[in-house]
């Protein structure tokens, strides 16, 4: 499924990715265009009845009827049923001897909560965007990235995980969401669908994208990972979807081309160093911001999420190869690697640009802005 | 605490079979990577290969046209075959997980078994 | 495929000493480099991974720096449980390498 244009906002500057579809509100289907995306049903990270989403939390849309082709429970990952939300929230680390965190998977046992509590916590991700609801924040400002682009050698680690593919990213490269607020980049990995399933992990108005890149950085005020997860602040997440587009994405394609030697689960390569800036959108002034969590286990809490606003293009063949290459635990295809959307919880998504302002038919309708947090300053 | 241990022949005629399995508790042989790393009497270390819990293999070209690695999941071992040894063989074998750092991808052994002697000889 | 030689071949010292060895790639490994100990009839241990990082567990008089080719594992004050053999190992391509290793022996 497609967004369709309502007022195209061109991005600032020609992306070598090509992307140029903005996710503005004016670029938003009306409620009538846009169906919300079935999440994957019972999932083991279900918010308890305390935490159900309030009004503010999900867009009010109409479901689609069978006719219009609705995504059917039937169709989805069978899972078992949610795990207990009223566990303690518990943000630490666990030690790699104790219960690490690789015992999981997309649907199924273990809830996740079992496997890290912290995954019942009150404010986790991914969340679904709601550009009218967007806090507007001049304070933030265009994202930084320095020596983002790598030279050949040394060579870049590729692994299917089995849970996604994750590309380990050397030290150096440094990025800021404002002034005093840095990081180095750690890895970046791919959420994606299977054929016809969009699968990336935020969705927009309930509107669920084909995939969605994540590169994942420690803040410079850590000297390790473990000891950054679950501070706030302490990790930095930059996401953004990937779209059908009509031409092939170069930058993409380095990495692509080598998902077949990493078909089987727990296989990896070496890649030639590339320039990782030119696999996210060119557009870095324009972007949702908010306190979330990792997607997955451990889940922890304080990770701050910048949401390009501006999509990245890929070609029908190269989203085909993302979706039905690898394969994950129990020969299964790697697939649907998302989790649900999570309830905001009273959590407001900034914008670094006024999102909410909409000159689109809807604009009738009274618009609820939230008032910056300033985040940025 | 993750245990591994290694057992098998102390001694190997030239051109047979070595074969070591290692055993491994305290913890599932699930979702990690498996290693071989082998220590010539006085010598340094050299790695052998690895195994992912799933089946996935990686050898070290040096060794990969004689050696094989395999994995039971259901007894939580693997094991090591290495044909057509010569005396160049001897030496301390070490079986190691390979953990990883699931945010960075970082790998490392982190847990050794303490190691048996094979010996090559007629 | 990557060799990785360490310096010194051995070194003395006493209790309480700073001791620094170094290791240098022939090519590129960015951070992928790791620090084991090893005594005599023991499996080597884990003490630095990620060239930087401290092995939980691990006294914190073990440092490691360094990326790229060459590398540093630091010892801030000798005891007498730490001599033994110190090997470096890279894992940033196929096949996974060790130094010739460092023996620490008392002065």
């Known amino acids: 499924q497609r967004l369709p244009r309502m007022q195209e906002d061109s991005p600032l500057g020609g992306g070598s990715s090509g992307e140029d579809d903005p996710l503005g509100e004016e670029d938003l289907p009306s409620e009538e265009d846009s169906p919300r995306e079935e999440d994957p049903p019972g999932e083991e990270d279900l918010p308890g009845e305390e935490d159900l989403p309030g009004e503010e939390d999900l867009p009010e849309v109409k479901p689609k009827s069978e006719e219009e082709g609705s995504l059917k429970l039937e169709d989805l990952p069978t899972v078992e049923a949610p795990g207990d939300p009223q566990e303690p929230q518990n943000n630490a680390h666990r030690d790699k001897e104790g219960d690490d965190q690789s015992h999981w998977r997309y649907g199924g046992d273990p809830p996740w909560p079992r496997v890290s509590p912290a995954c019942a916590g009150r404010f986790q991700s991914p969340v679904d965007i709601r550009p009218q609801l967007a806090a507007f924040c001049p304070a933030l400002r265009p994202l930084e990235l320095l020596g983002f682009q790598l030279p050949p050698l040394p060579e870049l680690r590729l692994r299917n995980n089995g849970h996604s593919v994750q590309l380990t990213l050397p030290p150096g490269l440094e990025m800021a969401l404002g002034p005093g607020r840095e990081y180095r980049a750690l890895q970046l990995h791919l959420h994606w669908g299977a054929a016809g399933r969009p699968g990336s992990e935020h969705t927009v108005e309930g509107h669920r994208f084909p995939a969605e890149i994540h590169v994942v950085h420690l803040s410079t005020a850590f000297a390790r990972v473990d000891e950054a997860l679950g501070r706030p602040g302490g990790l930095a997440v930059l996401a953004a979807f990937l779209e059908e587009g009509p031409e092939e994405n170069s930058a993409y394609e380095q990495l692509l081309s080598r998902l077949e030697e990493i078909a089987e689960e727990g296989s990896e390569t070496q890649v030639p160093g590339l320039d990782i800036s030119a696999l996210l959108p060119s557009d870095f002034s324009r972007y949702f911001q908010y306190e979330g969590s990792l997607t997955t286990p451990p889940c922890a809490q304080g990770v701050i999420w910048t949401v390009f606003n501006q999509t990245v293009m890929l070609s029908a063949k190269q989203l085909h190869t993302l979706s039905d290459t690898l394969w994950g635990p129990g020969d299964s295809r790697l697939q649907l690697n998302f989790r649900a959307t999570q309830p905001l919880n009273g959590r407001v998504i900034e914008a670094s640009f006024p999102a909410g302002v909409d000159s689109s038919p809807r604009a009738a309708e009274p618009v609820q802005l939230n008032s910056c947090l300033a985040a940025g300053d | 605490q993750v245990q591994l241990q290694e057992s098998g022949p102390g001694l190997v005629k030239p051109s047979e079979t070595l074969s070591l399995t290692c055993t491994v508790s305290g913890g599932s042989i699930s979702s990690y990577y498996w290693s071989w790393i082998r220590q010539p009497p006085g010598k340094g270390l050299e790695w052998i290969g690895y195994i992912y819990y799933s089946g996935s293999t990686n050898y070290n070209p040096s060794l990969k046209s004689r050696v094989t690695i395999s994995v039971d999941t259901s007894k939580n071992q693997f094991s090591l075959k290495l044909s057509s040894v010569t005396a160049a063989d001897t030496a301390v074998y070490y079986c190691?997980?390979?953990?990883?750092?699931?945010?960075?991808?970082?790998?490392?052994?982190?847990?050794w078994g303490q190691g048996t002697l094979v010996t090559v000889s007629s | 495929d990557i060799q990785m030689t360490q310096s010194p071949s051995s070194v003395s010292a006493s209790v309480g000493d700073r001791v620094t060895i170094t290791c240098r790639a022939s090519?590129?490994?960015?951070?992928?480099l790791a620090w084991f100990q090893q005594k005599p009839g023991k499996a080597p241990k884990l003490l630095i991974y990620?060239?930087?990082s401290l092995q939980s567990g691990v006294p914190s008089r073990f440092s490691g720096s360094g990326s790229g080719t060459d590398f540093t594992l630091t010892i801030s004050s000798l005891q007498p449980e730490d001599f033994a053999t110190y090997y470096c190992?890279?894992?940033?391509?196929?096949?996974?390498?060790f130094g010739q290793g460092t023996r620490l022996e008392i002065k």
């Open positions: 090519q590129g490994i960015s951070s992928w």
């Open positions: 990620a060239a930087s």
């Open positions: 190691a997980r390979r953990g990883y750092d699931f945010l960075t991808g970082y790998d490392y052994f982190d847990y």
């Open positions: 190992q890279q894992a940033n391509s196929f096949p996974i390498t």
